[in-house]
């Protein structure tokens, strides 16, 4: 899913207030819902009919530093006999997410949001058939 | 996938620099990669063997204001005949993502990152069989 562009009013103060300095805002360092629970089924990446592998990218100047990307293992899907069926398609499910980028200039540290496209997993679909002719 | 807790050093300046005021940092208002392209297949939510619906939540004090959540349509998966097969399971694929929360106190505006758990889509899996003793 695609994150829309940030509205120009999002970083502004209410109309009745003095304007904010252009270009930067105050970011509180805590994170809301930091202890939130992900309740994904066990090993769905290997049990799926469109299985996938994970690779991890690491960047110490990004939060989260670790971003995990899925790659579909097959072109087709795994059928009930455990064989690949290429009349179906394993396709990636992608999600735009935000990360926080840390920027250093000498002793000045600032932060900026960054959009990252994450492949979260794969699903098995009936392909769009463009009939021969 | 779960986002780890933010390390206590992430918001700190380099050791040789004077310490930063406790609790807040400078956030640049631009967004890196704002025009990034999501290349999801057409209508995969309806073409999947584990199809899903989308619902949208809206919050004007959050960026992105719109967060889309998927819900699997079925307990089972759709077979080659278009019928639900409950020997397989449609399961949600979840992803922890960050959003930016805007907080007002009078004319003071600050921002804080918030973790949100998003169900991005569904995949069809072989169920974990718990054998009857």
């Amino acid at each position: 899913r695609k994150i829309p562009k940030v509205g120009h009013t999002f970083f502004q103060k209410p109309e009745s207030c003095p304007p904010v300095p252009e270009g930067s805002m105050k970011l509180d360092t805590g994170i809301i819902n930091e202890n939130q629970r992900v309740s994904m089924s066990r090993n769905i990446e290997s049990r799926s009919t469109s299985p996938w592998n994970y690779t991890v990218t690491w960047d110490p100047n990004r939060y989260p530093s670790e971003v995990v990307q899925a790659q579909c293992k097959h072109l087709g899907c795994i059928n009930a006999q455990g064989k690949e069926d290429i009349s179906m398609n394993s396709v990636p499910i992608q999600q735009e997410t935000l990360v926080l980028r840390r920027k250093h200039q000498g002793c000045s540290v600032s932060f900026q949001l960054e959009k990252v496209l994450v492949t979260v997993g794969c699903t098995c679909v009936t392909p769009v058939v463009h009939h021969v002719q | 996938r779960k986002i780890p807790k933010v390390g206590h050093t992430f918001f700190q300046k380099p050791e040789s620099c004077p310490p930063v005021p406790e609790g807040s940092m400078k956030l640049d208002t631009g967004i890196i990669n704002e025009n990034q392209r999501v290349s999801m297949s057409r209508n995969i939510e309806s073409r999947s063997t584990s199809p899903w619906n989308y619902t949208v939540t809206w919050d004007p004090n959050r960026y992105p204001s719109e967060v889309v959540q998927a819900q699997c349509k079925h307990l089972g998966c759709i077979n080659a005949q278009g019928k639900e097969d409950i020997s397989m399971n449609s399961v949600p694929i979840q992803q922890e993502t960050l959003v930016l929360r805007r907080k007002h106190q009078g004319c003071s505006v600050s921002f804080q990152l918030e973790k949100v758990l998003v169900t991005v889509g569904c995949t069809c899996v072989t169920p974990v069989v718990h054998h009857v003793q």
């Epitope: 579909c72 097959h74 072109l75 087709g76 059928n79 009930a80 064989k83 690949e84 069926d85 290429i86 009349s87 398609n89 394993s90 396709v91 990636p92 392909p127 769009v128 058939v129 463009h130 009939h131 021969v132 | 290349s39 297949s41 077979n79 080659a80 005949q81």
Partner: antibody, heavy 118, light 112 residues
Amino acid sequence: QFQLVQSGAEVKKPGASVKVSCKASGYTFTDYNLNWVRQAPGKGLEWMGVIHPDYGTTSYNQKFKDRVTMTVDTSTSTVYMELSSLRSEDTAVYYCVRYDYGDAMDYWGQGTLVTVSS
Amino acid sequence: DIVMTQSPLSLSVTPGQPASISCRSSQSLVHSNGNTYLHWYLQKPGQPPQLLIYKVSNRFSGVPDRFSGSGSGTDFTLKISRVEAEDVGVYYCSQSTHVPLTFGQGTKLEIK
């Protein structure tokens, strides 16, 4: 008009690798799978594998699984087939072939002759 | 792997006469979705193969109606109602129901 244009003939030594390209035109490149099929001199057809140009996902014939790599460059509408650890029995014409799901291999490239000889 | 067996391996036909090629698969080619992914190709001398018939009996665009396909399960037939000189070459049956995709060994058609 649909076209699949392959790279030119190659002569390789045993143990080397070869990379054959196939440039597609005349249709929406990401809408169709592309297969690689080979034909040894005077012999029949042998399927090597298939790639989905949109995702780069592949399905390989187990016979070639450890030696073949299929890749895609969507910016140039080109797919590549690399075969490593070449032996004399890999001497063949290699075809890239468009594939419409479950229908059939409808359009074939002109073929690329790969000769493996010491 | 599915083995595709063609017969005869060669045939010589007088122009205007019919011809028939048989193809047998080692397993059923009926997919769980109900389709049968059995196809026929012709490779003319010095050319890449070309699609004639897809999914048992569907003629590809531009293929003359003297070519027809039939069969089900494991037994399939390609018929040419009246052979013409331009029909010479090697005919292959192929299946794409199961991975890996496989081809028959080919049937060489010559003109008498």
